[in-house]
């Protein structure tokens, strides 16, 4: 096989003759040097995606289940491209699967079961699938058949496509739950129908069929979205309160070897000449000889999917949860409501062994998962291989742009008692450098700088959003003649400066000797210049407070801060001295585990807090000999954050805004694909 | 600081037991939490077992039932009872104290187990 030629999967006669004109057409517009296609004919989809992960097609386009299938092992096969829908300028690549209700109704997503339900037709995603996954393990057992456990469940149904004899319930709303549009209640506009008339209490359908059917804002506000919290939301705000949100339909490819960029080559080349309304003689999105050849029809064009994103990701939580209840019927033998063990997402082993005494001593009321990078953490919970972590307030953001929500702030200043309800306003992000140097927050061009992380509030963002103001371009590593930002490309001048060892070099955990705060301030004690850090970085490590080699004979009088008026002023005086203000590091999870996140921290820190003395011979939460592992060694508590339960009202307008400029020199993979 | 050393490992067969001993040079009365880990070939370092001072023990879901940790301050020994052992258990196991800070890689030699089927 030609090394740029992708093997496309066509599953029947009518796709594999569009595919050879496809193939056709592109050879003509293509250089000879340039992608190629080549069609490979199976039985089915699932045989298509076989055959992809052995290596005899590259290429297939599927529907959301199917891509579940084909992320499950042995496929293991990636989104790579998704079709879009509606306007190059507003690209739809989702939909949301919602659950609509009207409003003068007073029930909540749990408490569902006794009422009459509307469905889009048995076996469809946004009205069986999704609901019936989610609502699986609240069903009456057996279980199985489904369809006898659902008429149990609900007081009265409509299922169009469901068989009335077997399962008379299912057909209650609807007599004989027929299958086409002769069934007034059949789809999405019929589900909608069947509430709107009052024949049943919810309706299972997708967000944007309310706005067809419902062209009147007024007529519009009679109804709601039932939330997975248990809240309600109006019909607007569906993208934060749905049951699942559906890819559409995804180009996929195997995630090693997967040929993704050639992929995305010929497809971009292919939608600039036969895209819509682009070539009377062959059109990708029109399917002459059938109906959704290849692609869909209703196609407008395509999108990378980006290199971050896998197939759990791409799906997402609620989606896979719903997928894999239905498909593997288990549940957990815990009632739904009993908080079940949290898994600590832990960065690299040192974080894991902290991790692992903890688990030890909580009796196993906290678990462990590892990962690499912070970013990496935030990916698992988001997918539910873990539950929460401490974050920057720089992760924070991105780990709110991913869906998950703050649930608990470290405070840093609150004396015990009234520490677990006190709001703190936050820490100061300083510049510290040596007080023998003659450097000004206005001469640091061509210095050496030393950061806590990439991506991170006082090593990163807050610095370099005040530089990036000042120099209006994102070429950071040309500014500082070198430096240490662990999580930087390898090959950067920010990672010149990084200690390692080796294979751990300028990587964004604690394996690297200059990550974090202490391991920032190290930096500038060994190699650098200045240091973006915290206002209690120094005090921390200077005094014989740290006693590490390096640190045990530092004096806090040998350094100074950079004040942006161009002054500088004693470590003592970060309130008068320092870049901005910035939000406390807080605790964050997955919405649906939230509240267990939180009773349980709750209960820990009361055994494990700051109120433990002698941590030589016990464990205590909050300390690691200065390397922050899990939380910050100078938290006193995790308080409560209230109203704050957002990541935009937790982090501030100021601060969101600040990050949000700083967006476009993110260097954020994760970022990308939560934003995609 | 207390060093740490482990014994007991040997090759068994499947359904047999074994128990690990692990013996600090100074007292273990006032160290906080102790464990057990193992290693298999290419894997990550994980936790099997853990015991706090106040004697509440911590097990891995693969090894509940039929594993049994155990410390005997007296005799400065940290133990692992391995009851029912199978093929699985194979890897080296090592003893830790915690006490020593966390991004301090100290690990003793360990002692291997091998469960044949």
């Known amino acids: 096989v030609p090394e740029k030629s992708v093997r496309w999967c066509a599953v029947s006669e009518h796709e594999a003759t569009k595919c050879q004109s496809f193939r056709d057409h592109m050879k003509s517009v293509l250089p000879s040097n340039g992608p190629s296609v080549a069609c490979v004919k199976k039985a089915s989809h699932l045989d298509c995606i076989r055959a992809i992960a052995a290596n005899e097609a590259d290429a297939v386009t599927l529907d959301a289940g199917l891509v579940y299938d084909a992320y499950l092992a042995p496929n293991n096969l990636k989104p790579v491209v998704a079709e879009f829908y509606g306007s190059k300028e507003d690209p739809q690549t989702f939909y949301y699967a919602v659950a609509v209700v009207k409003k003068d109704s007073d029930f909540q997503m749990n408490q569902l079961r006794g009422r009459k339900s509307c469905h889009t037709g048995l076996g469809r995603s946004a009205g069986w699938n999704i609901p019936i996954g989610l609502l699986y393990c609240d069903l009456p057992e057996p279980r199985k058949p489904l369809e006898k456990a659902v008429a149990n469940f609900f007081s009265g149904s409509c299922v169009p496509c469901a068989d009335g004899t077997d399962f008379p319930q299912l057909c209650q709303l609807c007599p004989g739950c027929g299958c086409s549009t002769l069934n007034q209640y059949f789809s999405y506009s019929g589900a909608f129908k069947c509430l709107k008339d009052g024949a049943g209490d919810v309706a299972f359908v997708k967000h944007s069929t309310i706005f067809e059917n419902l062209a009147n804002k007024a007529d519009r506000d009679q109804y709601e979205l039932l939330c997975l919290d248990n809240t309600r939301k109006s019909v607007d705000e569906y993208k934060d309160c749905h049951l699942a949100r559906v890819p559409s339909h995804t180009v996929v490819a195997r995630s090693v070897g997967g040929k993704e960029d050639l992929i995305w080559e010929l497809l971009n080349q292919a939608q600039e000449h036969f895209g819509k309304d682009k070539s009377k003689e062959f059109q990708l999105f029109s399917s002459p000889h059938g109906k959704d050849l290849l692609f869909k029809d209703s196609a407008h064009g395509f999108l990378k999917v980006p290199p971050r994103m896998d197939a759990k990701m791409y799906l997402g939580y609620e989606y896979i949860t719903a997928i894999r209840n239905l498909r593997e019927g288990t549940c957990p033998e815990a009632p739904t409501d009993e908080c079940k063990p949290v898994k600590w997402c832990a960065l690299s082993h040192h974080e894991r062994l902290k991790c692992d005494e903890w688990s030890v001593n909580s009796a196993g009321k906290i678990e462990c998962e590892s990962a690499e990078t912070t970013e990496d953490c935030i990916a698992k919970i988001m997918n539910g291989e873990a539950d929460a972590m401490s974050l920057d307030g720089g992760f924070v953001y991105i780990a709110g742009m991913c869906g998950l929500v703050p649930v608990l702030a470290e405070n840093y200043n609150t004396p015990n008692p009234n520490c677990e309800n006190t709001a703190e306003e936050g820490y100061f992000a300083v510049a510290v450098v040596k007080s023998s140097s003659d450097l000004t927050w206005d001469n640091l061009k061509g210095k050496k700088s030393c950061h806590t992380a990439v991506g991170r509030t006082a090593g990163w963002n807050i610095p370099m959003g005040l530089l990036y103001s000042k120099i209006n371009h994102c070429r950071f590593d040309e500014f500082f003649s070198e430096g240490c930002a662990p999580g930087s490309e390898k090959n950067s001048s920010l990672c010149k400066l990084c200690m390692g060892p080796s294979p751990n070099l300028c990587e964004p955990n604690n394996k690297e000797g200059y990550y974090g705060y202490t391991g920032a301030f190290r930096c500038l004690v060994e190699k650098g210049d200045v240091a973006f850090v915290k206002h209690q970085t120094v005090p921390q490590n200077t005094g014989g407070k740290n006693p590490d080699a390096w640190a045990k004979n530092l004096k806090e009088e040998d350094y100074e801060l950079l004040c942006l008026d161009g002054s500088r002023k004693s470590v003592q005086e970060p309130a008068n001295c320092h870049l901005a203000r910035a939000p406390n590091h807080a605790v964050v999870a997955r919405k649906d585990k939230a509240d267990c996140v939180q009773t349980l921290l709750l209960d820990q820190q009361r055994m494990f807090g700051s109120s433990v003395t002698d941590c030589s011979s016990n464990f205590c939460l909050f300390e690691s000999k200065t390397k922050d592992l899990l939380f910050r060694d100078d938290t006193v508590c995790l308080a409560k954050l209230h109203d704050r339960n957002t990541y935009e009202k937790y982090l501030g307008e100021e601060y969101v805004k600040a990050v949000t400029n700083l967006r476009k020199c993110s260097t954020s993979p994760l970022l990308e694909a939560c934003t995609f | 600081q207390v060093q740490l050393v482990e014994s007991g490992g040997g090759l068994v067969q499947a359904g047999g037991s074994l128990r690990l001993s692990c013996v600090a040079s100074g007292s273990i009365a006032s160290i906080a939490t102790m464990a057990w880990y193992r290693q298999a070939p290419g894997q990550q370092r994980e936790l099997v077992a853990g015991?706090?001072?106040?004697?509440?023990?911590h097990y891995a879901d693969s090894v509940k039932g039929r594993f049994t940790i155990s410390r005997d301050n007296a005799k400065n020994t940290l133990y692992l009872q391995m009851n029912s052992l199978e093929p699985e258990d194979t890897a080296v196991y090592y003893c830790?104290?915690?006490?020593?800070?966390?991004?301090?890689?100290?690990w003793g030699q360990g002692t291997q187990v091998t469960v044949s089927s």
């Open positions: 830790t104290d915690y006490s020593r800070r966390y991004y301090e890689d100290y």
């Open positions: 015991i706090t001072r106040g004697g509440s023990t």
